[in-house]
């Protein structure tokens, strides 16, 4: 038979950050290859990563067509060297992925502090708006374009000379905070989607940026 000694894939897992979305699975193939199919609940199956010896498949191009849909994928196992033939009627072994809803489940990527500027006892901290692979009219959209007011940022800031952290929140990409004159401060930001109730609610913290380094500017 055409599928003798092929093993069904298992541990199908979605890995997604800022909508860049890859399906991973096991096992590493021995004398077999894989083809992936993806579909929305109401749509047709679309094949991707044909006869690959990899154990991952980048499905970003499919899910960014509608990040608010729920997707299902499946991985078919074929003997190595398999060539599609019209006469084959036997369905190869396959495994279904968990459902995946990008808007609710994609992880938030690590944010970056774009700049900070001190004017007297105020500091304006700006977070860089990350680009995604989601498009509108052939233009790539930013994370803010996709999530809008669902996305907030938390700023952690502290005096360079102490460890006591303060926090601020914004639903824009800017913070305006009060600081003590003559003190240097360090900053880190985190992206948050408050409406989420799961572990992917928050990003990892951005790299720390401190006053007195190149990203900052000071004016009296």
């Amino acid at each position: 038979s055409g599928t003798t000694n092929t093993v069904a894939a298992y541990n199908l897992t979605w890995k997604s950050t800022n909508f860049k979305t890859i399906l991973e699975w096991e096992p590493k193939p021995i004398n077999q290859v894989y083809t992936v199919q993806i579909s929305t609940k109401s749509g047709d199956w679309k094949s991707k990563c044909f006869y690959t010896a990899d154990t991952e498949c980048d499905l970003t191009d499919e899910i960014v067509k509608d990040v608010k849909q729920t997707y299902l994928a499946r991985v078919f196992s074929y003997p190595a060297g398999h060539v599609e033939s019209t006469g084959s009627t036997e369905e190869p072994p396959y495994e279904n992925s968990p459902e995946f809803t990008p808007y609710l489940e994609t992880n938030l990527g690590q944010p970056t502090i774009q700049s900070f500027e001190q004017v007297g006892t105020k500091v304006n901290v700006t977070v860089q708006d990350e680009w995604t692979l989601v498009r509108r009219n052939d233009t790539f959209l930013s994370l803010r374009d996709v999530f809008g007011k669902d996305l907030i940022y938390t700023l952690y800031y502290w005096k360079s000379s102490s460890s006591g952290k303060k926090t601020a929140k914004t639903n824009t990409n800017e913070f305006l905070i009060d600081v003590d004159k003559g003190e240097n401060y360090c900053f880190s930001v985190q992206a948050v989607i408050p409406s989420r109730r799961t572990a992917n609610r928050k990003s990892t913290d951005s790299p720390v940026e401190c006053m007195g380094h190149e990203k900052g500017e000071s004016r009296e």
Epitope: K41, T70, R144, D150, E174, R196
Partner: antibody, heavy 120, light 113 residues
């Protein structure tokens, strides 16, 4: 085709409880905010609050907080607006609406409205 | 809360003539991250539910005639109708879609002269 279908008109007495509904179809219900908007007779639009059915997360206008409750049952693609004790001043048309696809892109689809009349 | 103020409140227009409605917000609706203004316009025709016309201050919703256009940034916004038609009568609302609580203007009633 995206549709929001609201429950029918209600006539109630002050102090009574009420739950009105909004059933979504033609789209992935869990990923779009459902908004509730009040329009008192001859007046403008007032945003009451919203819910993201996928997580149950809600936001309320402080003017309505504590007086109404917004909920959703994603298994039947339906959102609800409820009162435990109605007042005459709750007499109004209530609309549900669905958020747009992009962030902060308005209320793209609206239900037909539910007229609530509260009178002794 | 962000207060939205529309003017005029009543706008009588002759068919074929242009019309303009102003909307001012008490705080900027410009998102620094993506430079979009989160200002939305709706039309509520007599006896109907409201309908979305414009979002992001100037992006026309699909199916909305191109005689409708939105402009402005920060706190000052304008909805223009290049040539008013009889079917355009109703109440026009602007809305802060930038931050909670979402707030509407008091409405501008457009009527045919």
């Amino acid at each position: 085709e995206v549709q929001l279908v609201q429950s029918g008109a209600e006539v109630k007495k002050p102090g009574e409880s009420l739950r009105i509904s909004c059933k979504g179809s033609g789209y992935t219900f869990i990923t779009y905010w459902i908004e509730w908007v009040r329009q008192m007779p001859g007046k403008g639009l007032e945003w009451m609050g919203d819910i993201l059915p996928g997580s149950g997360s809600t936001n309320y206008n402080e003017n309505f907080k504590g007086h109404v409750t917004i909920s959703a049952d994603k298994s039947i693609s339906t959102a609800y607006l409820q009162w435990s004790s109605l007042k005459a001043s709750d007499t109004a048309m209530y609309y549900c609406a669905r958020s747009g696809y992009y962030g902060n892109s308005g209320f793209a689809y609206w239900g037909q409205g539910t007229l609530v009349t509260v009178s002794s | 809360d962000i207060v939205m103020t529309q003017s005029p409140l009543s706008l009588p227009v002759t068919p074929g003539e242009p019309a303009s409605i102003s909307c001012k917000s008490s705080q900027s609706l410009l998102s620094s991250g993506n430079q979009k203004n989160y200002l939305t316009w709706y039309l509520q025709k007599p006896g109907q539910s409201p309908q979305l016309l414009i979002y992001w201050a100037s992006t026309r919703e699909s199916g909305v005639p191109d005689r409708f256009s939105g402009s402005g940034s920060g706190t000052d916004f304008t909805l223009k109708i290049s040539r008013v038609e009889a079917e355009d009568v109703g109440v026009y609302y602007c809305q802060n879609d930038y931050t909670y609580p979402l707030t509407f203007g008091q409405g501008t009633k457009l009527e045919i002269k």
